[in-house]
Every structure is written in structure tokens, then in C-alpha cells.
């Protein structure tokens, strides 16, 4: 399968820009925004500080940490309403993320 | 509107102690951690310290001991400062620490002076 | 102990021009990536304006880009603007647990001409 020029392959994701016009699905992580190809009952998410394609059940129940969102070695948790995550790094230093 | 402001910033005199308070707004404390930086006049920032929700304080090495940064309340970080010497004048701030240090406070001045 | 130097301390620009501030630290920033750079007008606070080494912060012109991973990075800033004259620092963050948890460049000051 050829992919045209700015053709994503299924199933993966790339960073672009805020005043990018793009008609691909997208989800703000921190203040970047992904455009991504996914598969079926699949959603733009997170992986690993990284956007990702990710079960769109995850993205529905608003269970972020099963994304596994966070570093390696890094530990996650659900902010109090599901409004995000946070992940904490060794040594207890916190990197928020929130989904609008 | 998420916002900072510190408060407590006061001329002393060399071996006194102060508390600086940063109060935050439009965020909640427990979901975030927070900095505390300082620069002398004319010169460039230096970071102090930073707090998360639960955890102990971590220090830059030169501040262990002097200085003790502590939450407060729901909505206040506290940094408390000992023995102040001269070198110690500056303009204190506090940023939330997340993805960079977005927002600052304004800063609060401490002129240590004989 | 942890050290950011930048460089080069003070450098000009004509107005168009394209600016280069490198920053470099003693040992890896956490995650390879986590560096943050920073605008500051005199009685101001600090501005930031990138995150992440590359992310360009809410509100920050894309005239400013950042680059660069590990130890090494660089802020260029091209179609120099008048309002651009400010002193700008790069801030590294490392792991809590083995060292400070974060430190900062010396600051690059920017002159218009």
C-alpha cells in the first residue's frame, strides 16, 4: 500500500501543529495536538508521553491511566472528576494532563 | 483564570527569618506542583525549590537546610527563609511547575540590609 | 552538581534578522526532552514560551522554535521583532530523586538594532 504525501499509515499519529488545517480526527495533549489515522473502535489518545491510537472505550469511560499514559517508571492517576491524569515521576515530581 | 501571588517580601535585617506565601487561584494544588525561583537584582533566575501535591519538598542543593518550602492550605505554598544574609536580596517568585513554569506570580522583594 | 550554560551571554539583531541561543547541560534533562525556554522583560516575570524542547507554548508565536535533545538545544528566533528584546533563559529538568530538580541558564540577553 503507497501512501500519499501527508498520508498517515492506520494506526498511527504524528504532532502538528495548532493552526494546521486538518480534517483528521484530533485530541489536545498538554498544549500539542495529533493528527491521527486509527483503526476501528480506535481513538486519538496518549501512550507513553506520545500521541497514540488507543481503545475508544478507554477515551468513553475516561479511564486515561489505561492508555498507560506516563513514562516508564512513572506512576499514574486519574485527576478527582476524570478531567485527566497525572503522572508521577521518580523522586515525586507531577506532570498534569487535562482533556478538553 | 489560573494565577499566583506571593506576598510577605519585606526589608530585614542579616539573620532574620521570613515566610514568603504564594497563593494560588483557578487551579487546585493537588493536581499540580509548584516552584519556587528567585532573582537578585540585575542578575538571572535561580530555582529554589519545588513542592508537589503529596510528596516531601526537593530543594536545589545550595538552598538545603536555609530554606523550607511547605503547602499550607488547599490554596497556599509557604517558603520559609533563615539566617538571611545580603546575598539573599532578590525578587521571589512562584510558578506553577507542569509543563515548563506557566504561570509566574508578579514576585514578591526581599531587601536584606544592615 | 547540575550546570546550564547558555550562550552566548548578550547578542543583537536587526529587525528580520534570525537569532540563535544555545543552551547545554552537564547531564541529560529527564525524559531526554524536558527543557523549557523563557522570555523576561525587565520588572516582569518570566514568560514561558517553549516546553518539551520543541512544544511552542500557548499563545507564543511560531516564530520561536526550540530544538534539540539530551544535552544539547537551541532557541532561534527569525523575523526579529522590536518587542523581542528581552533577556531569554533555558530551564532543565531532571530527576527529583538523584539531583536538583531543576536548574536554569545563565540568560542570553537580546538586543534590537
Known amino acids: 500500500q503507497f501512501l500519499k504525501e501527508g498520508q498517515l499509515a492506520a494506526g498511527t499519529c504524528e504532532i502538528v501543529t495548532l493552526d494546521r488545517d486538518s480534517s483528521q480526527p484530533r485530541r489536545t495533549i498538554a498544549r500539542q495536538t495529533a493528527r491521527c489515522a486509527c483503526r476501528k473502535g480506535q481513538i486519538a489518545g496518549t501512550t507513553r508521553n506520545k500521541p497514540s491510537c488507543v481503545d475508544a472505550r478507554i477515551i468513553k469511560t475516561k479511564q486515561w491511566c489505561d492508555m498507560l499514559p506516563c513514562l516508564e517508571g512513572e506512576g499514574c492517576d486519574l485527576l478527582i472528576n476524570r478531567s485527566g491524569w497525572t503522572c508521577t515521576q521518580p523522586g515525586g515530581r507531577i506532570k498534569t494532563t487535562t482533556v478538553s | 483564570q489560573e494565577q499566583l501571588v506571593e506576598s510577605g517580601g519585606r526589608l530585614v535585617t542579616p539573620g532574620t527569618t521570613l515566610t514568603l506565601t504564594c497563593t494560588v487561584s483557578?487551579?487546585?494544588?493537588?493536581?499540580?506542583?509548584v516552584s519556587w525561583v528567585r532573582q537578585a537584582p540585575g542578575k538571572g533566575l535561580e530555582w529554589i525549590g519545588y513542592?508537589?501535591?503529596?510528596?516531601?519538598p526537593h530543594y536545589a542543593s545550595w538552598a538545603k537546610g536555609r530554606f523550607t518550602i511547605s503547602k499550607t492550605s488547599s490554596t497556599t505554598v509557604d517558603l520559609k527563609m533563615t539566617s538571611l544574609t545580603t546575598e539573599d536580596t532578590a525578587t521571589y517568585f512562584c510558578?506553577?511547575?507542569?509543563?515548563?513554569?506557566?504561570?509566574w506570580g508578579p514576585g514578591t522583594l526581599v531587601t536584606v540590609s544592615s | 552538581e547540575l550546570d546550564l550554560t547558555q550562550t552566548p551571554s548578550s547578542v543583537s539583531a536587526a529587525v528580520g534578522g534570525t537569532v540563535t541561543i544555545n543552551c547545554q547541560a552537564s547531564?541529560?534533562?529527564?525524559?531526554?526532552?524536558?527543557l523549557a525556554w523563557y522570555q523576561q522583560k525587565p520588572g516582569q516575570p518570566p514568560k514561558l514560551l517553549i516546553y518539551?524542547?520543541?512544544t511552542l507554548a500557548s499563545g507564543v508565536s511560531s516564530r520561536f522554535k526550540g530544538s534539540g535533545s539530551g544535552t544539547q538545544f537551541t532557541l532561534t528566533i527569525s523575523d526579529v521583532q522590536c518587542d523581542d528584546a528581552a533577556t531569554y533563559y533555558c530551564?532543565?529538568?531532571?530527576?527529583?530523586?538523584?539531583?536538583?530538580?531543576?536548574?536554569f541558564g545563565g540568560g542570553t540577553e537580546l538586543e534590537i538594532l
Open positions: 510558578a506553577r511547575d507542569n509543563y515548563g513554569m506557566d504561570p
Open positions: 513542592i508537589a501535591n503529596n510528596y516531601n
Open positions: 547531564q541529560s534533562v529527564y525524559n531526554n526532552k524536558n
Open positions: 530551564q532543565g529538568e531532571f530527576s527529583c530523586s538523584s539531583a536538583d530538580c531543576n536548574a
Open positions: 518539551a524542547a520543541s
Open positions: 483557578g487551579f487546585s494544588l493537588s493536581s499540580y506542583g
